[in-house]
Amino acid sequence: APVLPGEDSKDVAAPHSQPLTSSERIDKHIRYILDGISALRKETCNRSNMCESSKEALAENNLNLPKMAEKDGCFQSGFNEDTCLVKIITGLLEFEVYLEYLQNRFESSEEQARAVQMSTKVLIQFLQKKAKNLDAITTPEPTTNASLLTKLQAQNQWLQDMTTHLILRSFKEFLQSSLRALRQM
């Protein structure tokens, strides 16, 4: 099974405590990624004023970032475990190109950006083992991802800062919603 970052042998079977359940292990792993995102957001906010920008201005950006909706079966109303798990895995796979884009966007937090990217790959593997309906999971086309990456990297400085901020914010929101949903499984 994939090794979850932030987890050492004592987490799995510490003396005088119960071993972590699968749900708690996934939770711990997602929290590790969220901590990484927090650190990256700090650096982004410190070097630009993107974090103060209004939501309306941000919404004008034409990034097609994965977002959870009611139809995905991840909310308490209309919760559907199989549909939701497919949405979470598909969404994480779609975020991978954006996490690749982030790799050259940080100076002091370069290692943190790499850790977020690698941990997400491990999370995807971990969740794929849990999924019953793997055929329903659509993997983005490598050529589409490559051209998207080129397009993002060709933006001016202001747009690149805005894109970085939006990716981090959206990824945080997607993971937090995933956390809520995964706890119901």
């Epitope: 119960q18 972590l20 359940t21 749900s23 708690e24 939770d27 711990k28 997602i30 929290r31 969220l34 939501k55 977002k67 959870m68 909706a69 009611e70 991840c74 909310f75 308490q76 109303s77 929101e173 937090q176 919603s177 956390l179 809520r180 706890r183 119901q184």
Partner: antibody, heavy 120, light 106 residues
Framework: EVQLVESGGGLVQPGGSLRLSCAAS????????MIWVRQAPGKGLEWVSD????????YYADSVKGRFTMSRDISKNTVYLQMNSLRAEDTAVYYC?????????????WGRGTLVTVSS | DIQMTQSPSTLSASVGDRVTITCRAS??????LAWYQQKPGKAPKVLIY???TLESGVPSRFSGSGSGTEFTLTISSLQPDDFATYYC????????FGQGTKLEIK
């Protein structure tokens, strides 16, 4: 000043409806995770519902599921609790509160509460 | 809903005593637990979050521990201001509370 102010409480007959409002100031509800908690007279705290700002995802306690609806109006920076088919056991002080934006979250801001009395 | 069972429901103690309140979750909740103090007629205030992190401004005599299903709140040396009701709350799924522990003067 960062605060939450509840309103809309009062006396209502069993089977009736009431809508509570919670006006937020000093922060925006559009990027915060909000919660309603109630406390029956002389009893403990009971979580009622919460609303995660992302896509407006709501969760409800089993005791109110299907009867209560939590919603928000971002333009008014206000959260609501629509309470239908009220019962005597819904009598309580209703607190509006904010979950801290962290993982795991905790309640870092409370309103002063509004009293709802369900009685004939 | 996740059930939170708090014990004892009432605790009689004296100033200077060390007291411990326990909270048990009906399923594993990792460290998604907070402790609150409530005084009559007032809204609760957070003491401990993430199971063991002390809220800023809260005296260091308060401490929290535990993970998974078993949690404790300890007050190392009771002060007159500490006589109140204490609640644990999980935020793993929803936000259910324990039934409360009333700490009273012996």
């Amino acid at each position: 000043e960062v605060q939450l102010v509840e309103s809309g409480g009062g006396l209502v007959q069993p089977g009736g409806s009431l809508r509570l409002s919670c006006a937020a100031s000093g922060f925006t509800i559009s990027s915060n995770y909000m919660i309603w908690v109630r406390q029956a007279p002389g009893k403990g705290l009971e979580w009622v519902s919460d609303l995660y700002y992302y896509a407006g995802d709501t969760y409800y306690a089993d005791s109110v599921k299907g009867r209560f609806t939590m919603s928000r109006d971002i333009s008014k920076n206000t959260v609501y609790l629509q309470m239908n088919s009220l019962r005597a056991e819904d009598t309580a002080v209703y607190y509006c509160a904010r979950w801290a934006d962290d993982h795991p979250p905790w309640i870092d801001l409370w309103g002063r509460g509004t009293l709802v009395t369900v009685s004939s | 809903d996740i059930q939170m069972t708090q014990s004892p429901s009432t605790l009689s103690a004296s100033v200077g005593d060390r007291v411990t309140i326990t909270c048990r979750a009906s399923q594993g909740i990792s460290s998604w637990l907070a402790w609150y103090q409530q005084k009559p007629g007032k809204a609760p205030k957070v003491l401990i979050y993430k199971a063991s992190t002390l809220e800023s401004g809260v005296p260091s005599r308060f401490s929290g521990s535990g993970s998974g299903t078993e949690f404790t709140l300890t007050i190392s040396s009771l002060q007159p201001d500490d006589f109140a009701t204490y609640y644990c709350q999980q935020s793993w799924l929803g936000g259910s509370f324990g039934q409360g522990t009333k700490l009273e003067i012996k």
